[in-house]
């Protein structure tokens, strides 16, 4: 898999979800003690992880393949998908128990309560997605993925409720992108700034990704999009498969559908 | 190239309030942590507290809890630290100095400093 | 609070002498960093993660230590090296400074 932006392309590994996240020291892997570990969340405004918080975590796709200390000196780290090079083939926390010794070095596995949290992977019919904070104004340096995968046979039907991202000419510094895919490397629809609603895109099979990124200045409303799956039906009664293809800034660029 | 550019010299009453600037130059403000410090004529240096500019989180070494309030506005890439009830023991210099928010940390830029004199 | 002790507080040293000052800490650290501080004007970071050093500063500078103990060296000292030089923790709640190693010239 490739790695690209807090994601593994091709899966569904997130770097952050439900308010936990990942952390090595400066000098690399499996290098803070229990104290230090501790130390690293509560100067992020958290602290250690629960084994709780990070099984919650790891069932909306939180997969890193590192052993952290938790809270309570416990050690272990989260698999969504079994692979030879990690989890011995395993899926779920990799527990190494609550260690005797506290002075053993591991990476961290903190929990943010403050968190403005966004992303994730979504199975449900009917579901909105909101820029963190909406409708208060995002922040800067966000990035979140949303993960749609509904049942087979099901598209998915995408609508813009509220958009309001700063405007840039090449949507380069705000943006939303859609996939009409599981990753954000195929499939790619349009990307999406300013503040004139997109119109509705409907997706070519089950699945849909969309991400929204903003940069280090500058940040505005946000945004609300909603998806409701749609039934199979007869090609005659279809929606149009494809994205909008206005000019200007609200779609930056409009690729063509790749099917799955 | 990275800069931090600190409001000049102060001069204050005991019980009154003063707000130091701090303006970042040359690095992305959001990407980095801001961290304030203390030194009092002839003495070291003593670590007060930082804010995390992205989020706005802040945290203050205990003595300083109810000292310093630390702020930060994205829009000038400028972190404050508003120092209350001023005391003659308040007199220092005061330096502003980034971290990267990697651990351990240390911080690898300084502000010139600003001197706050408190007389009455 | 991790209590860092410099020592000596103010040492001298002629021209191309080695020169040796340490810190000790009150609760062991994986990583030590070094300051120099000149008359009137900010600190610089001087040594990062124990022994790496910062930009610019000259390769007589060593740093070296684990644990409790640490120190910073300089191979042959120079005038330009005259300055006070403080160790500072980065790893536990709250951050803290040495009190410092004046050094001057002989």
């Known amino acids: 898999w490739g790695f690209k932006d807090g994601i593994f392309h091709n899966s569904i590994w997130l770097e952050r979800a439900a308010g936990v996240y990942h952390r090595e020291a400066r000098s690399g892997k499996y290098k803070l003690t229990y104290a230090e570990a501790k130390a690293v969340c509560e100067f992020e405004g958290g602290h250690l992880a629960t084994y709780k918080q990070l099984e919650a975590a790891r069932k909306i796709g939180f997969h890193v393949c590192a052993a952290g200390w938790m809270a309570k000196g416990r050690v272990g780290y989260p698999i969504v998908k079994p692979g030879p090079n990690c989890g011995f083939g395993k899926t779920g926390i990799i527990d190494y128990g609550i260690r005797l010794n506290r002075s053993e070095r591991w990476d961290a596995y903190c929990y943010n309560p403050h968190a403005k949290e966004c992303g994730g992977v979504f199975t449900d019919p009917k579901q909105i997605f909101k820029s963190p904070g909406f409708p208060n104004e995002y922040e800067d340096n966000q990035i979140c993925y949303w993960h749609i995968r509904l049942k087979y046979g099901q598209r998915i039907h995408l609508s813009f409720l509220d958009f309001d991202l700063e405007d840039d000419p090449g949507c380069l510094a705000d943006y939303v992108e859609i996939y009409d895919s599981y990753d954000d490397v195929h499939g790619f629809v349009g990307r999406y700034c300013g503040d004139e609603l997109p119109d509705d895109i409907i997706s070519t099979g089950n699945v849909m990704t969309l991400k929204f990124l903003s940069d280090a200045s500058v940040t505005a409303g946000g945004f609300q999009i909603k998806y409701v799956a749609m039934d199979p039906v007869s090609k005659s009664s279809q929606g149009k498969n494809t994205s909008t293809t206005s000019t200007g800034n609200k779609n930056f660029l409009a690729g063509r559908f790749s099917h799955l | 190239q990275v800069r931090l550019q600190q409001s000049g010299a102060e001069l204050a009453k005991p019980g009154a309030s003063v707000k130091l600037s701090c303006k970042a130059s040359g690095y992305t403000f959001t990407s980095y942590w801001m961290h304030w410090v203390k030194q009092r004529p002839g003495q070291g240096l003593e670590w007060i507290g930082y804010?995390?500019?992205?989020?706005?989180?802040?945290k203050n070494k205990q003595n300083f809890k109810d000292k310093a309030t630390l702020t930060a506005d994205k829009s000038s890439s400028t972190a404050y630290m508003q120092l209350s009830n001023l005391t003659y023991e308040d007199s220092a210099v005061y330096s502003c100095?980034?971290?990267?928010?990697?651990?351990?940390?240390?911080?690898?830029?300084w502000g010139q400093g600003t001197t706050l004199t408190v007389s009455s | 609070e991790n209590v860092l002790t410099q020592s000596p507080a103010i040492m001298s040293a002629s021209p191309g002498e080695k020169v040796t000052m340490t810190c000790s800490a009150s609760s062991s650290v994986s990583y030590m960093h070094w300051y120099q501080q000149k008359s009137s004007t900010s600190p610089k970071l001087w040594i990062y993660d124990t022994s790496k050093l910062a930009s610019g500063v000259p390769g007589r500078f060593s740093g070296s230590g684990s644990g409790n103990s640490y120190s910073l060296t300089i191979s042959s000292m120079e005038a330009e090296d005259v300055a006070t030089y403080y160790c500072?923790?980065?790893?536990?709640?709250?951050?803290?400074f040495g009190s410092g190693t004046k050094l001057e010239i002989k």
């Open positions: 804010i995390i500019p992205s989020s706005g989180y802040t």
């Open positions: 500072f923790q980065g790893s536990g709640y709250p951050l803290t």
């Open positions: 100095a980034r971290s990267d928010g990697s651990y351990p940390y240390y911080f690898d830029y």
